[in-house]
Interface confidence: low
Amino acid sequence: RKIPKVGHTFFQKPESCPPVPGGSMKLDIGIINENQRVSMSRNIESRSTSPWNYTVTWDPNRYPSEVVQAQCRNLGCINAQGKEDISMNSVPIQQETLVVRRKHQGCSVSFQLEKVLVTVGCTCVTPVIHHVQ
Amino acid sequence: RKIPKVGHTFFQKPESCPPVPGGSMKLDIGIINENQRVSMSRNIESRSTSPWNYTVTWDPNRYPSEVVQAQCRNLGCINAQGKEDISMNSVPIQQETLVVRRKHQGCSVSFQLEKVLVTVGCTCVTPVIHHVQ
């Protein structure tokens, strides 16, 4: 799903207040709901009729440092006999997410939000058939 | 996928530097890759064999203000005849994501990261049959 553009409102102070100095804002330390966790069914990536693999990208100057990307294993979907059925399609499910980028020059450390596109998994769909004239 | 705990390292300055004052950090305005966007197949939520609906939560003090959650429509999966097959299961695919929470008291505005659990879509899986002793 899409993250809207920031525009110039969310991170601004009310109009009656002095502007934010130096184009930066105050980010409080700590993460709300940090202990909240994913509770997905086990091994769905291999049990799915549109199975996928995971790859992990690592960047120590990003939070979270690990971002996991899914790749659909097949073009078609897996039928009850365990065979690929190419009359159906495995398609990726994508999500826009925010990460935090750390930038430092010596002792001056600042952070910036970054939008990252994550493929979370795959689903099996009926293909759209185009009749070409 | 899971976002790790922040611990006490990512948002800290190097040990040789003076500590961050007042438990807050400098967040630069603007979002890197803001124009990056999801390019998913059209209407996959209704074409999927594990179809889902979307609901939107809205919070003006969160960025993004809109968070979209998916809910699987069925317990089973939709077969080639368009009927629900309860020998298979529709299961949610979840993703931990970050949002920014805005907190203000008068002209003092600060921001804090918040972890949100988003159900992005659903996939069709072979159920795990447990023979409970």
Epitope: S39, S41 | L75, I86, V91, Q94, V128, I129, H130, V132
Partner: nanobody, 125 residues
């Protein structure tokens, strides 16, 4: 967040019956498969029964099958454990739990994200 509150636990004689309700509040109750677990003194928590989101599908541990029935009333946001032919070995604290996903692995304790505080059932001989 989902809050779960069990009730109905008490002292009952062997061969007797009990009905344990578990009332849910918070996020939409119908979004969750629900389960009952129990923990006897000095033992690990164990799976008793579970019911799917739709209420059409239920699973039971072998030691309660035929004696216990799980049901749900979505209008009342309540799941019930109906217990009959109770035995002294059924003595335990009974916990209600909700899952945030469904895949047929009813008895896997780690799949249950939300838990009640428990209600004590004591079966005397």
């Amino acid at each position: 967040e989902v809050q779960l509150v069990e009730s109905g636990g008490r002292l009952v004689q062997a061969g007797g019956s009990l009905r344990l309700p578990c009332a849910a509040s918070g996020r939409t109750f119908t979004s969750y498969p629900m389960g009952w677990f129990r923990q006897a003194p000095g033992k690990e928590r164990e799976f008793v029964a579970a019911i799917s989101m739709s209420g059409d599908d239920a699973a039971y541990a072998d030691f309660v099958r035929g004696r216990f029935t799980i049901s749900r009333d979505d209008a009342r946001n309540t799941v019930y454990l109906h217990m009959t032919s109770l035995k002294p070995e059924d003595t335990a604290v009974y916990y209600c739990a909700a899952r945030t996903s469904y895949d047929g692995t009813y008895d896997y304790i780690d799949d249950y994200s939300y838990w009640g505080q428990g209600t004590q059932v004591t079966v005397s001989s």
